[in-house]
Interface confidence: medium
């Protein structure tokens, strides 16, 4: 099939294009080119007869067209009007016609663009700037570059007018950059020269240096002022409100007490019309001034931060003194003084370090004290406390829980039920509760300043039925005549009566037995071995009652004065001596024997076979209870007689 290929398809003005013919039939008589999509004699460009090799221009011939024997058409010096369709009409020898159409598009060679701006000196935070890429060109694409990067995404940057205009709203000093625009079409791409945006800003609040504000008579005062500004600021100095000079630096030699006062630096930007001032108070001392304390950390965090308190002003050859809570400094590894005593450092502050702190400067006549300074130590939160302490509630009542945790600043509270956040309040209130309000209630205390959080979890059970109670004890092994024991009946429940039984009987009347905490706690003072009984607590309300399992009190006692048996003290020679020692004690004591003061064996029974008069003497049994820490002993005299010398003597065992 006869086809036309345009090479190239997109043609730049002034260049040339070749309309290349493919699949040209054999046995041709001739062919003709026409402008447009159809054969129209009025729009014939050129005709060609093969037999005569004769080319004949038509009405649309411009003199820029060349036809080739293969029917291709070259058009030179392309102009915008050349855009469009071209039709080749082929006449075969048998006079049968064939047609094909091709096309190309003409684009101008783009000129180098330039940027125009509606505001050459925009003011920061006030003005908008609109950059426009010139010239306006049909069928061109516009692109923008900032510092040779594509445009950042910003709500303050807006493209409009087919991307030809870039608007910067509320310019800031950070918008000072190199801006370029680029135009593109299918045949060319051109970039503009850079335009530097000159944003007027400032002046910012000036900074006066040095920061030192205390001077002694006779020193030179040299103050310098600086404020960020475009164009650079103009500076003026005022002392106590009176204009001094228009310079960036203020120099006063050999100052006196009269030079004390407020020193103001004023920065002025003539383009923005703005003024900013900073004031510093300069104090010139003739003699040691009243000191004052500065701190490097006004809100230290407990157990984390150190605080350095410095006694101002710095005066050469001066003795500095410190007081805490109106006392001289205590000895503490957490308190450190600098070599000149001017700086007191508290390492790892605690909530007890609030002070007040005072420093003093010693002169020839007296000590000048600073005003007291109190530290605001941030601490906590500690573990929160949930009140009331009830864990068991009856359906239908109101549940009102309050949470508190020691904290500075005061903690912010959150409540969670079963791990799910409920509300951000210190109090949690649920009216008319039912069993489904049972759950794990967590209070979370958060200190926004330290960033620390602590939680406490409380189990709340809502039930008409009371649970089986249990007994907790503050002392599982009390010592007789020394310790007290407090039994507590768990859980703590609202509107509940607590009862106690000892060995299945109601409580005996005794000054050593005391009920407290709504009968929930039973305290036994000065326990005795007779208190080692089975204790049961019970809970009851109008619906149900329940008893705990018994808890048996294990009282540690003894050892009591031991008893040596048998009681005999006279023996016949040749008998066996078999002495047994026993002492009431819990736990069982350790036994040991001494004969005439000489340690023997650590057994409860002492056995000596076939004794003789040499075994006469004092036999002592020693008992000790490691649990009570108590000891006891008894001494027995044993007399051994020669056989047959005295009637009534024991034969021994």
């Amino acid at each position: 099939k006869l086809t036309i290929e345009s090479t190239p398809f997109n043609v730049a003005e002034g260049k040339e294009v070749l309309l290349l013919v493919h699949n040209l039939p054999q046995h041709l008589f001739g062919y003709s080119w026409y402008k447009g999509e159809r054969v129209d004699g009025n729009r014939q460009i050129i005709g060609y007869v093969i037999g005569t090799q004769q080319a004949t221009p038509g009405p649309a011939y411009s003199g820029r067209e060349i036809i080739y024997p293969n029917a291709s058409l070259l058009i030179q010096n392309i102009i915008q009007n050349d855009t469009g369709f071209y039709t080749l009409h082929v006449i075969k020898s048998d006079l049968v016609n064939e047609e094909a159409t091709g096309q190309f598009r003409v684009y101008p060679e783009l000129p180098k663009p330039s940027i125009s701006s509606n505001n050459s000196k925009p003011v920061e935070d006030k003005d908008a700037v609109a950059f426009t890429c010139e010239p306006e060109t049909q069928d061109a694409t516009y692109l923008w570059w900032v510092n040779n990067q594509s445009l950042p995404v910003s709500p303050r940057l807006q493209l409009s007018n087919g991307n030809r205009t870039l608007t910067l709203f509320n310019v800031t000093r950070n918008d000072t950059a190199s801006y370029k625009c680029e135009t593109q079409n299918p045949v060319s791409a051109r970039r503009s020269d850079s335009v530097i945006l000159n944003v007027l800003y400032g002046p910012d609040a000036p900074t006066i240096s040095p920061l030192n504000t205390s001077y002694r008579s006779g020193e030179n005062l040299n103050l310098s002022c600086h404020a960020a500004s475009n164009p650079p600021a103009q500076y003026s100095w005022f002392v106590n409100g009176t204009f001094q000079q228009s310079t960036q630096e203020l120099f006063i030699p050999n100052i006196t007490v009269n030079n004390s006062g407020s020193y103001t630096c004023q920065a002025h930007n003539s383009d923005t019309g703005l003024n900013r001032t900073t004031v510093t108070t300069i104090t010139v001392y003739a003699e040691p001034p009243k000191p004052f304390i500065t701190s490097n950390n006004s809100n230290p965090v407990e157990d984390e931060d150190a605080v350095a308190l410095t006694c101002e002003p710095e005066i050469q050859n001066t003795t500095y003194l410190w007081w805490v809570n109106n006392q001289s400094l205590p000895v503490s590894p957490r308190l450190q003084l600098s070599n000149d005593n001017r700086t007191l450092t508290l390492l790892s502050v605690t909530r007890n370090d609030v002070g007040p702190y005072e420093c003093g400067i010693q002169n020839e006549l007296s000590v000048d004290h600073s005003d007291p300074v109190i530290l605001n130590v941030l601490y906590g939160p500690d573990d929160p406390t949930i009140s009331p302490s009830y864990t068991y509630y009856r359906p239908g009542v109101n549940l009102s829980l309050s949470c508190h945790a020691a904290s500075n600043p005061p903690a912010q509270y959150s409540w969670l039920i079963d791990g799910n956040i409920q509300q951000h309040t210190q109090e949690l209130f649920i009216s008319n509760i039912t069993e489904k309000n049972s759950g794990l209630y967590t209070c979370q205390a958060n200190n926004s300043a330290s960033g620390h959080s602590r939680t406490t979890v409380k189990t709340i059970t809502v039930s008409a039925e009371l649970p089986k109670p249990s007994i907790s004890s503050n002392n599982s092994k009390p010592v007789e005549d020394k310790d007290a024991v407090a039994f507590t009946c768990e859980p703590e429940a609202q509107n509940t009566t607590y009862l106690w039984w000892v060995n299945g009987q109601s409580l005996p009347v005794s000054p050593r037995l005391q009920l407290s905490n709504g009968n929930r706690t039973l305290t036994l003072f000065n326990v005795t071995r007779n208190d080692a009984r089975a204790y049961v607590c019970g809970i009851q309300n109008s619906v149900s009652a329940n008893r705990s399992d018994p808890v048996t009190l294990d009282v540690l006692y003894g050892p009591d004065t031991p008893i040596i048996s048998p009681p005999d003290s006279s023996y016949l020679s040749g008998a066996n001596l078999n002495l047994s020692c026993h002492s009431a004690s819990n736990p069982s004591p350790q036994y040991s024997w001494r004969i005439n003061g000489i340690p023997q064996q650590h057994t409860q029974v002492l056995f000596i076979a076939k004794i003789t008069p040499n075994n006469n003497g004092t036999y002592a049994c020693f008992v000790s209870n490691l649990a009570t820490g108590r000891n006891n002993s008894i001494v027995k005299s044993i007399t051994v007689s020669a056989s047959g010398t005295s009637p009534g003597l024991s034969a021994g065992a």
Epitope: L416, D418, K436, T442, S463
Partner: antibody
Framework: QVQLQESGPGLVRPSQTLSLTCTVS????????MHWVRQPPGRGLEWIGW????????EYAPKFQGRVTMLTDTSKNQFSLRLSSVTAADTAVYYC?????????????????WGQGSLVTVSS | DIQMTQSPSSLSASVGDRVTITCRAS??????????MHWYQQTPGKAPKLLIY???NLQSGVPSRFSGSGSGTDYTFTISSLQPEDIATYYC????????FGQGTKLQIT
Amino acid sequence: QVQLQESGPGLVRPSQTLSLTCTVSGFNIKDYYMHWVRQPPGRGLEWIGWIDPENGDTEYAPKFQGRVTMLTDTSKNQFSLRLSSVTAADTAVYYCNTRGLSTMITTRWFFDVWGQGSLVTVSS
Amino acid sequence: DIQMTQSPSSLSASVGDRVTITCRASKSVSASGYSYMHWYQQTPGKAPKLLIYLASNLQSGVPSRFSGSGSGTDYTFTISSLQPEDIATYYCQHSRELPTFGQGTKLQIT
């Protein structure tokens, strides 16, 4: 004595609505969150959702959202499950259950009281 | 929602053996000092039965040979000495958000 009993048709046609009722005895359902859990044959347990019979509040598993409805009749101490547009994949044993107070520590959502289960087959 | 991965899916053990099943959550199911993980036993044709609640608490009436432990995302269920009546499928379930169950572990006796 606490008891939960599921009831409803054992056979449901595809694209129809499955309906089950759970009848509770031994406690007032208004005091508990009531749940439905199902178990396809030979497969694991799937939680469907809960209803608070006191106020009709519900929460459903995302898988069933849009197909499931839970209702309650507190006068009869009953709650029900409706699952629409069923397919063979909905064939399962359906259990109603709740968190009781048999533990000293109580919390949503573990289940210590269950019905015996009701097998529902989806088939034409 | 939180996904539960239970392993193994089945296991065989002898009477008296110590048996351990693990369950891993796709994110932590612990909050405010508690772990919201529970374990159930299901015998064929019966409803599941709660054994362990809040990771380690033994449900009333459940033998002490059953125990649970873990926090965060990783949890373990243990039978200290396997008995013939322990043949069942065991499921873990979390309640940190809307509940989901593990896929189950089928326990058989060799």
